[in-house]
Interface confidence: medium
């Protein structure tokens, strides 16, 4: 921000009023009126361009200092060239000294050139020369000079003529100040430069109404230059929830609008299923029947628990079951949708019933499934099970209520049994096979059916109670269909895979595991 | 020594034209300021135009804008008064006068000149 | 305009007295004043500039004063020579005035 200039004297503004003192008295230094632009202007002027040594002095008034540290005089006027008086006017000059004197008091009348210091010889940019004269074009030089730090109570500037034609036409003398500034939502007061130039004053900023710093943020700090810039931001302050910046200021939300935290963003509309919040809100309350999960933005609109699964199917496979859903027709506003499948059984003969989490297995585990099916395994034969599958959502748990939808299947088969081939040689094959723990209580025997490949006229059983056999009196190198199925006492089980199994050739004889 | 020698006085009627002239010697004519000022018979001083040293600006009496024209031609050292219009209360001794403001010892020029070097004048009277 | 109004319009003085002649300006023109002295059938010829500047060559017992509004001529021992008619003229503004004259004969 551009420096504040505090004016200590301005003599062009006072309209011949100041009552200067010249040295010496009534030569020298005249204090003339001239008319520019129609106007009347005063000045103060000497032209003693013909009379040899001239040591003409004219000094302010006294200028008190007040906070001043360092002054800056800007001066405006105007030199004739030498070149324009006849004869070149041997002793004329272009050029005057400008002097300081601090002091605590005015000394009047009393004038000692001696307590003044010397600022610097003024030169002009421009002379005036005769044409210029004639046309009354004023060549107008303007000069700063800068003083500090002064420590007295007031100053008199001075001005020493040794034989120029000049003319003073302005005298400001002022000091600078870093002015009133509002910046990132900071107010920083008005700071008296410093009179050092390398130096810059730090200046703590207070934030405006309804402004905060933010959280792990720097407190807001600027630095007064000399010339009276603020430099260096640092930090800034924020508005905080329920306030959003309005040019330099923060300003209360509007109703129907919030913001929840402090941040550089605007107030946001109040989201989708919320009751109008009042002004300066940091959120918006949901509407009955929705909510609002803990981990949600308040920008998020609230939402509600889903529907049930749409639409189950359980479709059964000996001892496994897949169970098929559709999501939920209204998913409450949410995408974060997951499934969970528990399981009952019921035993057809007592028709008691209990949960069957732990005697099943499940493809994936069944809580917080986020597809639509899951594989149910090691299902009991001969028992009734229903499925239920259950939609859940981040607002789930701030309800009572749940969202599921049920299948029931009964399994009326054991599961096929799992078959290797554990040996063979060129006349025999042993065979194992394994069903799951929960079913084999159910098991009977086991009837082991084979036949040569190709052969479709005959084939041999053999029952077995055990979970092998070997079978023998088979034809070397010779390819085998073999079946193992599962006997309960309410009759046949699910029938394995059929397997093809091969003996070993007579030049390979001996008993060979695989 | 500056000389200022004026012409082209006489007798002339109303609505009449007259062209005067102002020959001058002895100083840098370019270099000065040139004005006509007449003094009507028994009465005091009038200023009546100026013109700047190198032909501009020109300024006129309120009596005589628009019937005078000012003119100055620097490589003859001559200034001259075009009178067109004449009435009876233009008649009076038209002087030529000079000002140089190098003899002027003021940092600011006044906003007007004042007359350093006169010529004797011409007479110019205007009657039917 | 700027009128120039000269007082007395003539006086008469004897050969050494100190005469004193004023000008008074219609509104503020600062030192912006000439004094001419003509005599019958001459030309004007310049006395004073900047209303207390002497011209070149004209002698010292010519002296003049004041700013403003008010001004004066002043000879401090009237010589012969001085009988004539004195004008003031302003030239602050562009339409320069002179005063109507002060006619100065001898006692």
């Known amino acids: 921000a551009q420096g504040k200039e505090v004016v200590l004297l301005d003599f062009a503004a006072a309209g011949g009023e100041l009552g200067w003192l010249t040295h010496p008295y009534g030569k020298g230094w005249d204090l003339m009126q001239n008319i520019m632009n129609d106007m009347p202007i005063y000045m103060y002027s000497v032209c003693n361009v013909m009379s040899g040594d001239q040591d003409n002095w004219l000094r302010t008034n006294w200028v008190y200092r007040g906070e001043a540290e360092r002054i800056f005089i800007e001066l405006k006027f105007t030199v004739r060239d030498c070149n324009s008086f006849p004869g070149g006017a041997s002793s004329c000059k272009e050029t005057f000294n400008l002097y300081y004197a601090e002091s605590d008091l005015d000394y009047g009348t009393n004038f000692q050139k001696r307590l003044f210091t010397k600022i610097d010889t003024i030169a002009p940019d421009e002379i005036t020369v005769s044409s210029d004269f004639e046309a009354r074009h004023v060549k107008l030089n303007v000069e700063e000079r800068s003083v500090g730090p002064l420590t007295r109570k007031g100053f008199y500037l001075a001005f020493q003529d040794i034989g120029a034609c000049v003319a003073l036409l302005s005298v400001r003398v002022y000091y600078k100040k870093c002015p009133e500034l509002l910046q990132g939502l900071a107010h920083f007061p008005e700071t008296i430069a410093g009179s050092d130039a390398p130096s810059l004053a730090t200046v703590a900023g207070t934030c405006v109404d309804h402004a905060v710093v933010p959280p792990g943020g720097e407190e807001p700090r600027m630095h007064c230059a000399v010339d009276g810039e603020w430099l260096v931001p640092i930090g800034q302050c924020l508005c905080q929830a329920g306030y959003e910046k309005v040019e330099d200021a923060c300003q209360a939300c509007s109703p129907g609008f919030f913001k929840f935290e402090a941040s550089e963003s605007p107030c946001l509309e109040c989201p989708e299923h919320t009751l109008p919040s009042p002004e300066g809100a940091t959120s918006c309350e949901c509407e009955e029947g929705f909510f609002r999960a803990p981990q949600d933005p308040a920008s998020m609109p609230c939402t509600r628990p889903p529907s049930a699964p749409h639409y189950l199917t359980a479709v059964g496979m000996g001892a496994k079951v897949e169970l098929r859903w559709t999501p939920p027709q209204d998913s409450g506003g949410r995408e974060d949708i997951v499934y969970s499948v528990t399981c009952e059984q019921c035993w057809p003969e007592s028709g008691e019933c209990g949960p069957c989490e732990a005697s099943v297995r499940y493809s994936e585990p069944p809580h917080g499934l986020t597809r639509t099916s899951v594989t149910v395994s090691d299902l009991e034969p001969h028992m009734n099970y229903t499925f239920t599958v259950e939609a859940r959502n981040g607002v789930s748990g701030l309800v009572t209520s749940r969202s599921f939808r049920t299948a029931s299947v009964s399994i009326n088969q054991t599961e096929p049994p799992k078959v290797r081939l554990e040996g063979r040689s060129t006349t025999s094959l042993s065979v194992s096979w394994s069903i799951p723990p929960p079913q084999q209580s159910r098991v009977w025997k086991y009837e082991v059916t084979y036949r040569k490949k190709g052969d479709s006229n005959s084939y041999n059983v053999r029952r077995t109670e055990g979970f092998s056999v070997t079978l023998d009196d088979l034809a070397p190198d010779t390819t085998y269909l073999v079946q193992v199925q599962a006997l309960t006492q309410e009759g046949q089980g699910a029938g394995s895979k059929v397997h093809e199994f091969q003996t070993l050739s007579p030049e390979g004889s001996g008993n060979l595991a695989v | 020594e500056v000389q200022l020698l004026e012409s082209g006085g006489g007798l002339v009627q109303p609505g009449g034209s007259l062209r005067l002239s102002c020959a001058a010697s002895g100083f840098t004519f370019s270099h000065y300021m040139m004005a006509w000022v007449r003094q009507a018979p028994g009465k005091g001083l009038e200023w009546v135009s100026r013109?700047?040293?190198?032909?501009?600006?020109?300024h006129y009496a309120d009596s005589v804008k628009g019937r005078f024209t000012i003119s100055r031609d620097n490589s003859k050292n001559t200034l001259y008064l075009q009178m067109n219009s004449l009435r009876a209360e233009d008649t009076a001794v038209y002087y030529c006068?000079?000002?140089?403001?190098?003899?002027?010892?003021?940092?600011?020029?006044?906003?007007?000149?004042?007359?350093?070097?006169w010529g004797q004048g011409t007479l110019v009277t205007v009657s039917s | 305009d700027i009128q120039m109004t000269q007082s007395p319009s003539s006086l008469s003085a004897s050969v050494g007295d100190r005469v004193t002649i004023t000008c008074r300006a219609s509104?503020?023109?600062?030192?912006?004043l000439a004094w001419y002295q003509q005599k019958p059938g001459k030309a004007p010829k310049l006395l004073i500039y900047?209303?207390?500047n002497l011209h070149t060559g004209v002698p010292s017992r010519f002296s003049g004063s004041g700013s403003g509004t008010e001004f004066s001529l002043t000879i401090s021992g009237l010589q012969p020579d001085d009988f004539a008619t004195y004008y003031c003229q302003q030239y602050q503004s562009y339409s320069r005035t002179f005063g109507q004259g002060t006619k100065v004969e001898i006692k």
């Open positions: 006068a000079g000002y140089d403001s190098g003899y002027d010892y003021v940092a600011v020029a006044g906003p007007a000149e004042y007359f350093q070097h």
């Open positions: 013109i700047g040293p190198s032909g501009g600006p020109t």
């Open positions: 509104q503020s023109i600062s030192t912006w």
């Open positions: 900047k209303a207390s």
